[in-house]
C-alpha cells in the first residue's frame, strides 16, 4: 500500500488528464482527489498510465466505494477493469447492457478471464433472467459462451431468447444442456412452418425426444449425416429403417460411411437385416432374418 | 397401448413434503416429455412442471422453489414432490403425456392418469 | 404468465342444439390453444389443439377457431355425452395456462 504523503505544492490535480502521467505512484496517490477520479473516470482510458500507475488509481477509487462501485464509474473503468479482482466484481451491481457490452470490450479477443466470468454471472442474476438481448451480446463476444453454463444456469434462458442463438454458438454443448435448450427451441419456434421451423430448430436436436423425430420424418426435412450424428443415441434406436429414410431424404446414401460410429453404429444393430437391405447401401450388422427380436427394456417396464 | 397410474398417500400433513409417483406402461418413458398437472376440488387445472427421461426439468415459476420431478427410467416412473405444503395443496393430481406423433411443436397433453386426490390435512 | 379467461362461467343448452364456448388470452398465443373435455371423477381429455385441428378420435361436431387472443370451441349439436367442463390451454410460452373452465349443462 502507498504511504500517505503530502501533495507537493501546485501538484494538486484540478483534472484527470495526460500531465498525471509524469506523476509518480506517491504523487497520484497523494494528488488526485478519488471523487474527482470517480467522475473523470472516462478519461482515463485514453491517458497511456503504466501498470503501476493504474494500481493507484484503483486504490483510491477502493478507498472511495468499499462496498462496490456504482455504476456510474463501472461503466467507464475500461482497461482499469483488467485490474479487478473477482472479489471486487462481486460486490458491484450491473444492471445496464451498456455497462456490460463496454467491459466486454476491454476484453475482447482473449479467452473468458475469471473477472469476466463474474461480471457475466452478476449481471445475469441481476436481470432475473438470460434476456435476448443479453444472449445476444454475449455470444457475440464469446461464441462458446452458451455452452459453458451448466443446465441449471440454461434453466434460466427464456424460450425468446432462444431466436439469438446461432448454430455456432451450440458447437460444444453436450447432450445434457441440449436437454435444456431443445424443449425451449421447440416452443420458441412453433409457430413456423415446416421447412423454416427445421431450419431453426436443427443445431438443437441433440436434445430431441424419439417421438418428435418420429414427426420429423414424415416432414421431408432431408436432415443431413452431421446433424444426425449429434442426435442421441437413445432417440435414435427406436426409429425404423423406413422412418431414418424419411428423416435423411437423399442424406440417406451416408449412412454407409457412418456405420462404424454412434449413433448409426447402435441403430443398425437394433434393425432386422431385410429392412437394411432394402437401402441398397450394404450396410451390415443387423438383426439376421428368423431372429425374434426381445425388448428387454419394455419387458423390465411391464414386469 | 400407453396408460399412466398415479400412486402415492392421500393425506399428507402441511409443512410436510407431498410425493407422487407415475407409473408409465405399455410404452418407454423416453420418446416423450411427461407433466405434472394439479387441479383443486371444484377449480381449474394448473400445470406443475415436466421431466425428460435424461432428468431435464422445468417447473411454473409459482411452484418452482418447492417442486422436484425426478425419474427412474429402469422402473418407467417419474415423481414428483413438493415441499412445505398447505391447505391450498389440497388438489387431485394428474401425470400427463406432452403431445409427441400429433404435431412437432406443441406443449399440450393428448394422454393423463386418472388422477389421485391429496389431501393436506393435519 | 399468459392469463386465459372462459366465458361463460356455466352455459346451459338443450340436447341438438349449438353450443359456443369463449376463451380469451390476456396476450397473443398465436394458435397455439388446445381445448380438454371433463367429466366428474375423469381426467381432462384433448379435443382440440393448434386452435382448429380436432385430436385423433373426435367427432366432427367439435370444431374450433380463432388466433391471437380469441377462442371460440363450437358443439355443433349437443349429444348427452357433452355436458361436462371445458378447459381452454395456451402453450404458446412457459408457464402453461389454462383456463378457469366453462360448464356446460343440460337446459
Known amino acids: 500500500e502507498v504511504e500517505k504523503t503530502a501533495c507537493p505544492s501546485g501538484k494538486k490535480a484540478r483534472e484527470i488528464d495526460e500531465s498525471l502521467i509524469f506523476y509518480k505512484k506517491w504523487e497520484l496517490e497523494a494528488c488526485v482527489d478519488a471523487a474527482l477520479l470517480a467522475t473523470q473516470m472516462d478519461r482515463v482510458n485514453a491517458i497511456p498510465f503504466t501498470y503501476e500507475q493504474l494500481d493507484v488509481l484503483k486504490h483510491k477509487l477502493d478507498e472511495l466505494y468499499p462496498q462496490g462501485y456504482p455504476e456510474s464509474v463501472i461503466q467507464h473503468l475500461g482497461y482499469l477493469f483488467l485490474k479487478m479482482s473477482p472479489e471486487d466484481i462481486r460486490k458491484w451491481n450491473v444492471t445496464s447492457l451498456e455497462t456490460l457490452k463496454a467491459l466486454l470490450e476491454v476484453n475482447k479477443g482473449h479467452e473468458m478471464s475469471p473477472q469476466v466470468a463474474t461480471l457475466i454471472d452478476r449481471f445475469v442474476k441481476g436481470r432475473g433472467q438470460l434476456d435476448k438481448d443479453t444472449l445476444d451480446t454475449l455470444t457475440a463476444f464469446y461464441p462458446g459462451y452458451l455452452c459453458s453454463l451448466s443446465p441449471e444456469e440454461l434453466s434460466s434462458v427464456p424460450p425468446s431468447s432462444i431466436w439469438a442463438v446461432r448454430p455456432q454458438d451450440l458447437d460444444t454443448c453436450d447432450p445434457r444442456q441440449l436437454d435444456v435448450l431443445y424443449p425451449k427451441a421447440r416452443l420458441a419456434f412453433q409457430n413456423m412452418n415446416g421447412s423454416e421451423y427445421f431450419v431453426k430448430i436443427q443445431s438443437f436436436l441433440g436434445g430431441a425426444p424419439t417421438e418428435d423425430l418420429k414427426a420429423l420424418s414424415q416432414q421431408n426435412v432431408s436432415m443431413d449425416l452431421a446433424t444426425f450424428m449429434k442426435l442421441r443415441t437413445d432417440a435414435v434406436l427406436p426409429l425404423t429403417v423406413a422412418e431414418v429414410q424419411k428423416l435423411l431424404g437423399p442424406h440417406v446414401e451416408g449412412l454407409k460411411a457412418e456405420e462404424r460410429h454412434r449413433p448409426v453404429r447402435d441403430w443398425i444393430l437394433r434393425q432386422r437385416q431385410d429392412d437394411l437391405d432394402t437401402l441398397g447401401l450394404g450396410l451390415q450388422g443387423g438383426i439376421p432374418n428368423g431372429y425374434l427380436v426381445l425388448d428387454l427394456s419394455m419387458q423390465e417396464a411391464l414386469s | 397401448q400407453v396408460q399412466l397410474q398415479e400412486s402415492g398417500p392421500g393425506l399428507v400433513k402441511p409443512s410436510e413434503t407431498l410425493s407422487l409417483t407415475c407409473t408409465v406402461s405399455?410404452?418407454?418413458?423416453?420418446?416423450?416429455?411427461w407433466s405434472w398437472v394439479r387441479q383443486p376440488p371444484g377449480k381449474g387445472l394448473e400445470w406443475i412442471g415436466y421431466?425428460?427421461?435424461?432428468?431435464?426439468?422445468n417447473s411454473n415459476p409459482s411452484l418452482k422453489s418447492r417442486v422436484i420431478i425426478s425419474v427412474d427410467t429402469s422402473k418407467n416412473q417419474f415423481s414428483l414432490k413438493l415441499s412445505s405444503v398447505t391447505a391450498a395443496d389440497t388438489a387431485v393430481y394428474y401425470c400427463?403425456?406432452?403431445?409427441?406423433?400429433?404435431?412437432?411443436?406443441?406443449?399440450?397433453?393428448?394422454?393423463w392418469g386418472r388422477g389421485t386426490l391429496v389431501t393436506v390435512s393435519s | 404468465e399468459i392469463v386465459m379467461t372462459q366465458s361463460p362461467a356455466t352455459l346451459s343448452v338443450s340436447p341438438g342444439e349449438r353450443a359456443t364456448l369463449s376463451c380469451r388470452a390476456s396476450?397473443?398465443?398465436?394458435?397455439?390453444l388446445a381445448w380438454y373435455q371433463q367429466k366428474p371423477g375423469q381426467a381432462p381429455r384433448l379435443l382440440i389443439y393448434?386452435?382448429?385441428t380436432r385430436a385423433t378420435g373426435i367427432p366432427a361436431r367439435f370444431s374450433g377457431s380463432g388466433s391471437g387472443t380469441e377462442f371460440t370451441l363450437t358443439i355443433s349439436s349437443l349429444q348427452s355425452e357433452d355436458f361436462a367442463v371445458y378447459y381452454c390451454?395456451?402453450?404458446?410460452?412457459?408457464?402453461?395456462?389454462f383456463g378457469q373452465g366453462t360448464r356446460l349443462e343440460i337446459k
Open positions: 400427463a403425456r406432452e403431445v409427441g406423433r400429433i404435431a412437432v411443436a406443441g406443449w399440450f397433453f393428448d394422454l
Open positions: 405399455g410404452g418407454s418413458i423416453q420418446n416423450y416429455y
Open positions: 396476450q397473443s398465443v398465436n394458435s397455439n
Open positions: 393448434g386452435a382448429s
Open positions: 421431466i425428460f427421461y435424461s432428468g431435464s426439468t
Open positions: 390451454q395456451q402453450y404458446n410460452n412457459w408457464p402453461l395456462t
